[in-house]
Interface confidence: medium
C-alpha cells in the first residue's frame, strides 16, 4: 500500500533570464527512494539515481544543474519554459510517486511564489 505523499513547490513564477529551483519532497513513507526523474511535459530533463548519481538530458546540459538535493535548478529561463514539470519518485517497495509543479516565466520583474500543496 502506498502511504507516501509528494510535497512540491506548487505553482511558481520566475523572471525571464533568471533561474528557478524545482523541488519535491516525499514524506509519510519509509520506502527507499531509488531514483528521481524530472520531466517537462513530453521531455526528460534529468535523472538522479541513488547509486549512480545524476544524468542530465543532453538537450538540457547547458541550462540544467543538479540539486540542491534531489531537486533541479533550471537556468537561463525563457518564456518557452512556462509549463508543467513533474518529479517522479521511484521507490522500493512502494512503487512510483509523481509530483507536479507549474512554472510561469514572466517578462516582468514581478515573480511571486505560489503556496505549497500536496499530491497523494
Amino acid at each position: 500500500m502506498m502511504t507516501g505523499t509528494i510535497e512540491t513547490t506548487g505553482n511558481i513564477s520566475a523572471e525571464k533570464g533568471g533561474s528557478i529551483i524545482l523541488q519535491c519532497h516525499l514524506s509519510s513513507t519509509t520506502a527507499q527512494v531509488t531514483q528521481v526523474n524530472w520531466e517537462q511535459q513530453d521531455q526528460l530533463l534529468a535523472i538522479c539515481n541513488a547509486d549512480l548519481g545524476w544524468h542530465i538530458s543532453p538537450s538540457f546540459k547547458d541550462r540544467v544543474a543538479p540539486g540542491p538535493g534531489l531537486g533541479l535548478t533550471l537556468q537561463s529561463l525563457t518564456v518557452n519554459d512556462t509549463g508543467e514539470y513533474f518529479c517522479i519518485y521511484h521507490t522500493y517497495p512502494d512503487g512510483t510517486y509523481t509530483g507536479r509543479i507549474f512554472l510561469e516565466v514572466l517578462e516582468s520583474s514581478v515573480a511571486e511564489h505560489g503556496a505549497r500543496f500536496q499530491i497523494p
Epitope: E39, Q43, N49, L52, G53, H55, T96
Partner: antibody, heavy 118, light 107 residues
Framework: QLQLQESGPGLVKPSETLSLTCTVS??????????WGWIRQPPGKGLEWIGY???????YYNPSLKSRVTISVDTSKNQFSLKLSSVTAADTAVYYC??????????WGQGNLVTVSS | EIVLTQSPGTLSLSPGERATLSCRAS???????LAWYQQKPGQAPRLLIY???SRATGIPDRFSGSGSGTDFTLTISRLEPEDFAVYYC????????FGQGTKLEIK
C-alpha cells in the same frame, strides 16, 4: 525481467531506408525507468550506439548518424522502432535493441543482421 | 567524443588463471558512467559491471571492476571455460561510446 525482440527485413537495397522494430515484453515501454536504444555491430567489428528514445518521445542520436536516424515509440504496442535512411554497404551490421538506465544497457535483444546489398 | 582504448587486443590464458583487461579513456570519465560487457559468438552483449565496480544481477563474484578517471580495469579472478569471449568497456558522457574490445581466448 525485460525481454526485447528485434524484427524486420534482413536485406535492404542501397539508398533505401532500413526499418526495424523492437517488441518489449516483461515490462512496460511507458516506464520512466528506461530509455529504449539501438546499437549496431558490423560483422567482426565493435559496437556503435545509434540512439535512444524516452517513453515520452524525446530522442537522442549519435551525431555521426543523426541526419539519417529516426527512432519512435508505440506505447500501445509496447514497441519502439528504428529507421535509417540512405543506407550503404557500410550500414551492414547486426542491429540490437536494448533498454538503458541512462548509464548502461542492461537488457538486449538477440540482434537482427541487416545486409545492405543490391 | 570520448574514445575508449582497450588493451590488450587479445589475451591468451588458461582456465584457472587470472585475467586483467584494461580500458583507457581519452579524457576523464565519471566512475558512474563506465560499464563492462561480455559477448560470446552469435550472442548479444551481456552487462557485467556498471558504475565501474558494481556487478550486474546474476554476475559471478569472480568478475570485478575497478578504476577511476581515465583508467579502468576488469578482473576475472579465476577463469572458467565459459569466460572466454570478447569484452567491451562502455562509457556515457554526452553520448555512449564503446571500446574496440578485448578477445579473451584459451591458451
Amino acid at each position: 525481467q525485460l525481454q526485447l525482440q528485434e524484427s524486420g527485413p534482413g536485406l535492404v537495397k542501397p539508398s533505401e531506408t532500413l526499418s526495424l522494430t523492437c517488441t518489449v515484453s516483461g515490462g512496460s515501454i511507458s516506464s520512466s525507468r528506461y530509455f529504449w536504444g539501438w546499437i549496431r555491430q558490423p560483422p567482426g567489428k565493435g559496437l556503435e550506439w545509434i540512439g535512444y528514445i524516452y517513453y515520452r518521445g524525446s530522442t537522442y542520436y549519435n551525431p555521426s548518424l543523426k541526419s539519417r536516424v529516426t527512432i519512435s515509440v508505440d506505447t500501445s504496442k509496447n514497441q519502439f522502432s528504428l529507421k535509417l535512411s540512405s543506407v550503404t554497404a557500410a550500414d551492414t551490421a547486426v542491429y540490437y535493441c536494448a533498454s538503458s538506465s541512462a548509464w548502461y544497457f542492461d537488457y538486449w535483444g538477440q540482434g537482427n543482421l541487416v545486409t545492405v546489398s543490391s | 567524443e570520448i574514445v575508449l582504448t582497450q588493451s590488450p587486443g587479445t589475451l591468451s590464458l588458461s582456465p584457472g588463471e587470472r585475467a586483467t583487461l584494461s580500458c583507457r579513456a581519452s579524457q576523464s570519465v565519471s566512475s558512474s558512467y563506465l560499464a563492462w560487457y561480455q559477448q560470446k559468438p552469435g550472442q548479444a552483449p551481456r552487462l557485467l559491471i556498471y558504475g565501474a565496480s558494481s556487478r550486474a544481477t546474476g554476475i559471478p563474484d569472480r568478475f570485478s571492476g575497478s578504476g577511476s578517471g581515465t583508467d579502468f580495469t576488469l578482473t576475472i579472478s579465476r577463469l572458467e571455460p565459459e569466460d572466454f569471449a570478447v569484452y567491451y568497456c562502455q562509457q556515457y558522457g554526452s553520448l555512449y561510446t564503446f571500446g574496440q574490445g578485448t578477445k579473451l581466448e584459451i591458451k
